[in-house]
């Protein structure tokens, strides 16, 4: 898996949408867990209803919220009051059994509101990047 | 009606390479994972790994990796285990299983089987 | 890889008898674990699936219980087609493990 970039603005929402294969992962649970360090364990920061058929509900664990359209197959986390102690690298997973397979590698990048620094018509409001060292999107 | 048919009895020589078959049919063999599992005479059941026809995603046991080859065919429905060198200890029989997820518990188990596949080994 | 042990390795039983056999899990498994029946030279058969779940067209006198490592597969009345192996399987993770296996023989 390449490492997908979403950037977001300290202080305000991130969405990080997870595509995946609606038949290939039917009925598995999904999750988002912190990845701690480069070979370290993911912890798992939040994940979907228990009951799979309830997926679609959203479940929220602090600032952050997970929510899953399984039948069109797109799992997302919404970061609320992006802080830049929330950087760094994430996975969304799909459970089974105690086993977790990698939907996709997230790396959230904070950038500092721009509003401290230039006038809000100059706003650009930033979300998903595949500039990091060329990710790409694996499906 | 869910089926899956696999090939038949093969005698083989040590050395020599086989590759046997399963054809599912009865459902969308495009949307469930099929296993490999081995019963040696008299023995219990071994999971071997497992194949997703529809993008050829596979995972193998650690005993099995490097001995076997998984793979499938999704415009015949068909999944394959291959062996590039048999050995005798390779006598057994073979069958493959579709792997349904449960949504009540998110985990897979083996709803439907093939018939099973007897391959011997011997000089 | 998780060891699944099944006992007893065999049991003599006759028609309309309770039998119970045990399948114990090297570490915890919370419900994963499914029962298959296999009758010689042919494929096994699912009976229970999430340690507790009936699959559909299996006789109700199949139940199964327990979580965490200890699992109980209780037949209610045997019937002369019941008399066939038992096996435990894990799907907790993997690789998928099963159990040796229980033989139900007539008495």
């Known amino acids: 898996h390449n490492t997908t970039v979403f950037q977001g603005v300290e202080g305000q929402s991130l969405q990080v949408s997870c595509p995946y294969d609606s038949m290939k992962h039917w009925g598995r649970r999904k999750a988002w867990c912190r990845q701690l360090g480069e070979k370290g364990p993911c912890q798992r920061v939040v994940s979907t209803h228990n009951l799979w058929l309830l997926s679609f509900l959203r479940r929220r664990n602090g600032s952050t919220a997970i929510t899953d359209d399984t039948l069109g197959g797109t799992l997302t986390i919404t970061l609320r009051n992006l802080q830049p102690h929330d950087a760094g690298f994430y996975q969304c997973q799909s459970l089974h059994g105690s086993e977790a397979d990698t939907l996709r590698k997230v790396l959230v990048e904070v950038l500092a509101d721009p509003l401290d620094h230039r006038d809000a018509g100059d706003l650009w409001v930033p979300g998903e990047s595949e500039s990091f060292e060329d990710a790409h999107v694996e499906h | 009606e869910v089926q899956l048919v696999q090939s038949g009895a093969e005698v083989k020589k040590p050395g020599e390479s086989l590759k046997i078959s399963c054809k599912g049919s009865g459902y969308s063999f495009t949307s469930y994972w099929i296993a490999w599992v081995r019963q040696m005479p008299g023995k219990g059941l071994e999971w071997m790994g497992i194949i997703y026809p529809g993008d050829s995603d596979t995972r193998y046991s650690p005993s099995f990796q490097g001995q076997v080859t998984i793979s499938a065919d999704k415009s015949i429905s068909t999944a394959y285990l291959q062996w590039s060198s048999l050995k005798a200890s390779d006598t057994a029989m073979y069958f493959c299983a579709r792997q349904r997820t449960f949504y009540y518990d998110s985990s897979d188990y083996f709803d439907y089987w093939g018939q099973g596949t007897l391959v011997t080994v011997s000089s | 890889d998780i060891q699944m042990t099944q006992s007893p390795s065999s049991v003599s039983a006759s028609v309309g008898d309770r039998v119970t056999i045990t399948c114990r899990a090297s570490q915890g498994i919370s419900s994963w674990l499914a029962w298959y029946q296999q009758k010689p030279g042919k494929a096994p058969k699912l009976l229970i699936y999430?340690?507790?779940s009936l699959q559909n067209g299996v006789p109700s006198r199949f139940s199964g219980s327990g979580s965490g490592t200890d699992f109980t597969l209780t037949i209610s009345s045997l019937q002369p087609e019941d008399f066939a192996t038992y096996f435990c399987?894990?799907?907790?993770?993997?690789?998928?493990?099963f159990g040796q296996g229980t033989k139900l023989e007539i008495k």
């Open positions: 999430a340690a507790s």
């Open positions: 399987q894990q799907a907790d993770s993997f690789p998928r493990t």
